[in-house]
């Protein structure tokens, strides 16, 4: 009699022990998924602000007419700072017009002072012709001053006013661009 | 986890044309910028060409006015067309997907299997 009483205590316990599992099982999970809520709120609300005040560019980005530009504040080689560039859903600096670049220059000065900037021009090392990296040629008067003499790849570069060139793999800043978000006001 | 399927490699002969496409599992709106890469043997994987999610286009240096990319947003697809082929375009180009950020994580780039292009006569 008593062993059958001892049994039944024991099966009572690990009843009890398995409940008090479920229940810290419970609250971990009711605790995750208050937390996955928050996160889920913080989110949402988040996006619908971004979406309200719906700024052009992001932050620390510059605008100017159609387009938005960050200027790094690291050094990296041409390569890299295209694919930095590429990360943030832009592309390197794509100088369109003399208005465009007194802008870029006019900012920097303000920003930074003179230093050198990397922007999307290279030259291709068979014709020795200049391209933008989206395929498309400099206007006239937005070509490199000065020609490498570098027997490497050869990159486009701002600083101060002037477009200069150099070899691919030298360090600089660079200068990220892409399109400003437009109203939908 | 996003997959991203490329297709449209083989052996063409210097001068010709290929067209690559890379079928991506996720719409390209969550993604920053998709594009191509490749890696030759013995070489470091370099940047081909990659379009951002706002319509911007980069070229690598060597390939730049040889080399076009496209999209097709309907069918969540990026296409390389690559002409006038040297043997020095021969290596393995990837597809590659940059995320973008949701609420401050950072998440690596998908990168795809990689499709061989080999240019020779």
């Known amino acids: 009699k008593l062993l059958q009483v001892s049994t039944i205590a024991m099966q009572q316990q690990e009843k009890l022990i398995q409940q008090e599992r479920a229940l810290l099982n419970f609250t971990e999970w009711k605790r995750s998924c208050a937390l996955q809520m928050k996160y889920c709120q913080a989110f949402m609300q988040n996006s619908l602000s971004s979406a309200h005040n719906s700024s052009p560019c992001p932050n620390n980005w510059i605008q100017n007419r159609e387009s938005c530009y960050y200027v790094s504040e690291i050094w990296s080689i041409w390569h890299t700072s295209q694919e930095n560039c590429l990360k943030e859903g832009s592309t390197l600096l794509q100088i369109e017009s003399k208005e465009e670049m007194d802008f870029i220059t006019g900012s920097l000065r303000k920003i930074k002072g003179s230093y050198d900037y990397w922007v999307g021009l290279s030259q291709d090392g068979h014709s020795g012709r200049w391209l933008w990296q989206d395929g498309s040629s400099p206007s006239p008067g937005l070509l490199p001053a000065e020609r490498s003499q570098s027997a490497n790849q050869v990159c486009g570069y701002v600083k101060s006013n002037s477009l200069l060139s150099s070899n691919c793999s030298t360090w600089k800043y660079f200068i990220c661009e892409k399109y400003a978000l437009r109203s939908s006001v | 986890q996003v997959q991203l399927q490329e297709s449209g490699g083989g052996l063409v002969q210097p001068g010709g044309s290929l067209r690559l496409s890379c079928l991506a599992s996720?719409?390209?709106?969550?993604?920053?910028?998709m594009g191509w890469y490749r890696q030759a043997p013995g070489k470091e994987r370099e940047l081909v060409a990659a379009i951002t999610n706002g319509g911007r286009i980069a070229y690598g240096i060597a390939v730049n006015g040889r080399f076009t990319i496209s999209r097709d947003n309907a069918k969540n697809t990026v296409y390389l067309q690559m002409n006038s082929l040297k043997p020095e375009d021969t290596a393995v180009y990837y597809c590659?997907?940059?995320?973008?950020?949701?609420?401050?994580?950072?998440?690596?780039?998908?990168w795809g299997q990689g499709t061989q292009v080999t240019v020779s006569s």
């Open positions: 996720r719409s390209f709106s969550s993604f920053n910028a």
């Open positions: 590659n997907a940059k995320p973008t950020p949701v609420y401050g994580s950072t998440v690596g780039d998908y």
